[in-house]
């Protein structure tokens, strides 16, 4: 049963040429993390943090994304274009895959960046895969 | 100790069928992306095609002259990669590589030593 | 067909610096590997990432993409680096060799 809850940074703002952070964080859950991926709106994928391993940033964002802090993600040099929606995938054991959704605006102002934190719907499926119990490292 | 064996090689006829195996150890299989790669006598490096993690969709990629023929599969549970080969032609002759795709900096670099695979009638 | 060009052959004298290059359509947007192979053995990969070094290669090794145009940097080149080098263009969807270079050490 999925008993967890993600938490996002919800719907943010920042500036054009600027930089954002995106987080989300697993909560009211005992399962353990084996790997989170951030996706675009497109369903791109930005970036893996694999538990075990560590970070993998997808060549296409390789010069504009940094990995952290925590498990969020860093987006740098910031354009209109990124305007759009972000996932970050919980896959988890034993519970399954969680998912968040955070609302990303790019702004040609200099309107000030806000965050607005707040907890959201999950999806889930199971999750079959019976090697992921070897996955203990939780980071 | 990160190993990886290959195994399946041998000679086929034109038009015949092979398949081929790569037993990992020494890391947790299930979170790498995995490649075939294969090299024809006394020539260059060609790519075959990869398989992503289960945690990455588990979809499979393939260069354009094995699209078709060839089909690469994975089980987590046996620590074990697999290349299915179809349809071969004399081409395909050549020393088949499994290779851990280079994503991550801990788990990066990692090769067999091959499996010859003779087309030839 | 994505491709990627590398000289077939480059020399340079021991305790020289050797670069080889790997050129490819906005190669800078994919990882760029190398990798060095010697006769009769499995390839050993030396640069990933376009920069990074594996563990017990040697710092003499270095790697850059940016552009067209990935590099490969050997510095103070030593007799056993005398090898054939392949370039990869790496991404989310595939990855494709270089033709290889074979790098001679002089004298």
């Known amino acids: 049963m999925m008993t967890g809850t993600i938490e996002t940074t919800g719907n943010i703002s920042a500036k054009k040429g600027g930089s954002v952070i995106l987080q989300c964080h697993l909560s009211s859950t005992m399962a353990q993390v084996t790997q989170v991926n951030w996706e675009q709106h497109d369903h791109s994928l930005l970036a893996i943090r694999n538990a075990e391993l560590g970070w993998h940033i997808y060549p296409a964002f390789k010069d504009r994304v940094a990995p952290g802090p925590g498990l969020g993600l860093t987006l740098q040099s910031l354009t209109m274009n990124d305007t759009g929606e972000y996932f970050c995938t919980y896959h988890t054991y034993p519970d399954g895959t969680y998912r968040g959704r955070i609302f990303l605006e790019v702004l040609e102002s200099s309107v000030a960046e806000h965050s607005a934190r707040f907890q959201i719907p999950i999806e889930g499926r199971d999750y079959k895969d019976d090697d992921d119990k070897h996955h203990h490292h939780h980071h | 100790e990160v190993q990886l064996v290959e195994s399946g090689g041998d000679l086929v006829k034109p038009g015949g069928s092979l398949r081929l195996s790569c037993a990992a150890s020494g890391f947790t299989f299930s979170n790498a992306w995995m490649s075939w790669v294969r090299q024809a006598p006394g020539k260059g490096l060609e790519w075959v095609g990869r398989?992503?993690?289960?945690?990455?969709?588990?979809?499979?990629d393939y260069a354009a002259p094995v699209k078709g023929s060839f089909t690469i599969s994975r089980d987590d549970s046996k620590n074990t990669l697999y290349l299915q080969m179809s349809s071969l032609k004399t081409e395909d002759t050549a020393v088949y590589y499994c290779?851990?795709?280079?994503?991550?900096?801990?788990?990066?670099?990692?090769w067999g030593r091959g499996t010859l695979v003779t087309v030839s009638s | 067909s994505y491709d990627l060009t590398q000289p077939p052959s480059v020399s340079v004298s021991p305790g020289q610096t050797a670069s080889i290059t790997c050129s490819g359509d906005k190669l800078g947007d994919k990882y760029a590997c190398w990798y060095q192979q010697k006769p009769g053995q499995s390839p050993v990969l030396v640069i990933y990432?376009?920069?990074k070094r594996p563990s017990g290669i040697p710092e003499r090794f270095s790697g850059s993409n940016s552009g067209n145009t990935a590099t490969l940097t050997i510095s103070g080149t030593q007799a056993m680096d005398e090898a054939d080098y392949y370039c990869?263009?790496?991404?989310?969807?595939?990855?494709?060799f270089g033709g290889g270079t074979k790098l001679t050490v002089l004298g």
């Open positions: 398989i992503k993690s289960k945690a990455n969709g588990g979809t499979t």
């Open positions: 990432q376009d920069s």
């Open positions: 990869q263009a790496w991404d989310s969807s595939t990855a494709v």
């Open positions: 290779v851990i795709d280079p994503l991550y900096d801990i788990l990066t670099g990692y």
